[in-house]
């Protein structure tokens, strides 16, 4: 795969993943009422990071925000923080990667700068994806713990007055937002890895020439620190390098560029 295609694909995949992270963070269905093995209630409860909702059989839905910070579980606060950090890093990653895209020319930005920016955005996307995956996983773990605690309470008869009055124990299971978050985090992570891979292809080729120069004249030229730069004339500041890179770019541009990515 060409550098441009790899970079472009990485950008698009990260973008889709980032959009998913935002969607998951905003969604109300992080946890939904478990209906399995439960009496059929005419009320359906579900909760998000920011509010909890109740949908009645009548169709009436009421959502209430968590208007407190101190009263919320530390885990929920941690998940919120992780998702927000993921979003912030994703925004920065997108801004950096737009400038880093090989197909976009901005002034006289050389490939070494683009390579650095591509690597930076890739790392940002990787961290963003990891934040989302950790956030969602922490929440899922919290749900699993609470679920089994509720189940234990259910069967040990804790919810009743001397066993005479039954109470409906509302248990929560994984909501759609968790799956969206996992997939989105994974996509952002993959996109970030692709950007990092693309960075290697974008790296200025002076290092390659050093190697070639060394092997070609390995018997004749004595090694000395900085010697190759001096002998080849392909220092990081020279104009010649730019011309050579142009050749590499031409080869790259012959590859078919990714045009449209359909996703469901």
């Amino acid at each position: 795969m060409s550098v441009t295609a790899c970079q472009g694909l990485g950008f698009v995949v990260s973008l889709i993943g980032f959009a998913g992270i935002i969607a998951a963070t905003c969604m109300d269905q992080w946890s939904t009422q478990d209906l399995y093995n439960n009496p059929v209630t005419a009320v359906f409860n579900y909760q998000g990071l920011w509010r909890s909702c109740v949908r009645e059989s009548s169709g009436f839905t009421e959502c209430r925000g968590y208007f407190t910070l101190l009263g919320l579980p530390a885990m929920l606060q941690a998940v919120r923080a992780l998702m927000i950090v993921g979003i912030v890093l994703g925004v920065i990653g997108i801004l950096v990667s737009i400038f880093a895209l090989k197909c976009i020319r901005i002034g006289s930005m050389d490939d070494s700068a683009k390579a650095k920016m591509t690597l930076t955005s890739g790392i940002l996307f990787i961290i963003s994806g990891i934040c989302a995956i950790i956030g969602v996983s922490v929440f899922a773990n919290m749900l699993v713990t609470n679920f089994w605690m509720s189940t234990a309470n259910m069967y040990s008869g804790m919810g009743g007055m001397g066993g005479m009055v039954q109470t409906v124990q509302t248990r929560y299971t994984f909501g759609a937002a968790l799956f969206v978050g996992w997939v989105a985090g994974g996509l952002t992570l993959i996109g970030g890895v692709m950007m990092c891979i693309a960075c290697r292809g974008l790296t200025p080729d002076d290092s390659n020439f050093k190697a070639v120069s060394y092997h070609a004249s390995g018997q004749n030229v004595a090694y000395r620190p900085g010697g190759f730069k001096a002998s080849t004339g392909f220092g990081s500041n020279t104009r010649n390098k730019k011309i050579y890179d142009g050749g590499a770019r031409t080869e790259d541009d012959e590859q078919s560029h990714p045009t449209k990515y359909d996703y469901v």
């Epitope: 009422q33 009496p39 059929v40 209630t41 005419a42 009320v43 409860n45 579900y46 909760q47 909890s52 909702c53 109740v54 009645e56 059989s57 009548s58 169709g59 009436f60 009421e62 209430r64 919810g159 009055v165 039954q166 109470t167 409906v168 509302t170």
Partner: antibody, heavy 118, light 113 residues
Framework: EVQLQQSGPELVKPGASVKMSCKAS????????IHWVKQKPGQGLEWIGY????????KYNEKFKGRATLTSDKSSSTAYMEFSSLTSEDSAVYYC???????????WGQGTSVTVSS | DIVMTQSPSSLTVTVREKVTLSCKSS????????????LTWYQQKPGQPPKLLIY???TRESGVPDRFTGSGSGTDFTLTISSVQAEDLAVYYC?????????FGAGTKLELK
């Protein structure tokens, strides 16, 4: 003004079927679930089930499952209940009611009286 | 199924008297998600369909006089008529609207002394 207009009284023979209607007006029919309730003469109320006019999805009280069939017609904003294999125990007034928030039945039809007699 | 138990089955009252009707459910009708009790109260006069008075155990339906007050939580609920009027003589039903099948109490008949 919200209204639920039910069909007239029915006199049927044991073992027969009866289909009654409940025509809604004054609101968007598909936005509210319609419930059906049975009341025997001089007795209390018994929930039969509901029909969701938006999805045409019914839900039944196990006691009436198999004998009661709830349907709806969006075009005429009408809900229907068909009752089969009637016995004298089914002689009652049948009400349709609209479900609103709090799962409360806020508007009721005037009732359809069904008499099962040979 | 949830069993709704109303007491008393009938009550003889005088006009302007304060009346308390009781309703107990075999299971809690409190939904933890919104801390609301899914219990409704209806009034039924002879030859008429039931009329909604109270939903969410304590929320008065619009148009219902404020002498009608619903209270209680979990399994024990109360309908209070602060000052009975002649037009309040009817049968009062409580209903579970939390767990299917929706079930009604047997009713409390309010009669004039």
């Amino acid at each position: 003004e919200v209204q639920l207009q039910q069909s007239g009284p029915e006199l049927v023979k044991p073992g027969a079927s009866v289909k009654m209607s409940c025509k809604a007006s004054g609101y968007t029919f598909t936005n509210y679930i319609i419930h059906w309730v049975k009341q025997k003469p001089g007795q209390g109320l018994e929930w039969i089930g509901y029909i969701n006019p938006y999805t045409d999805g019914p839900k039944y009280n196990e006691k009436f499952k198999g004998r009661a069939t709830l349907t709806s017609d969006k075009s005429s904003s009408t809900a229907y209940m068909e009752f089969s294999s009637l016995t004298s125990e089914d002689s009652a007034v049948y009400y349709c009611a609209r479900l609103n928030r709090g799962n409360a039945m806020d508007y009721w039809g005037q009732g359809t009286s069904v008499t099962v007699s040979s | 199924d949830i069993v709704m138990t109303q007491s008393p089955s009938s009550l003889t009252v005088t006009v302007r008297e304060k009346v308390t009707l009781s309703c107990k459910s075999s299971q809690s009708l409190l939904n933890s998600g919104n801390q609301k009790n899914y219990l409704t109260w209806y009034q039924q006069k002879p030859g008429q369909p039931p009329k909604l008075l109270i939903y969410w155990a304590s929320t008065r339906e619009s148009g219902v006089p404020d002498r009608f007050t619903g209270s209680g939580s979990g399994t024990d609920f109360t309908l209070t008529i602060s000052s009975v009027q002649a037009e309040d003589l009817a049968v009062y039903y409580c209903q579970n609207v939390y767990i299917y099948p929706f079930t009604f109490g047997a009713g409390t008949k309010l009669e004039l002394k």
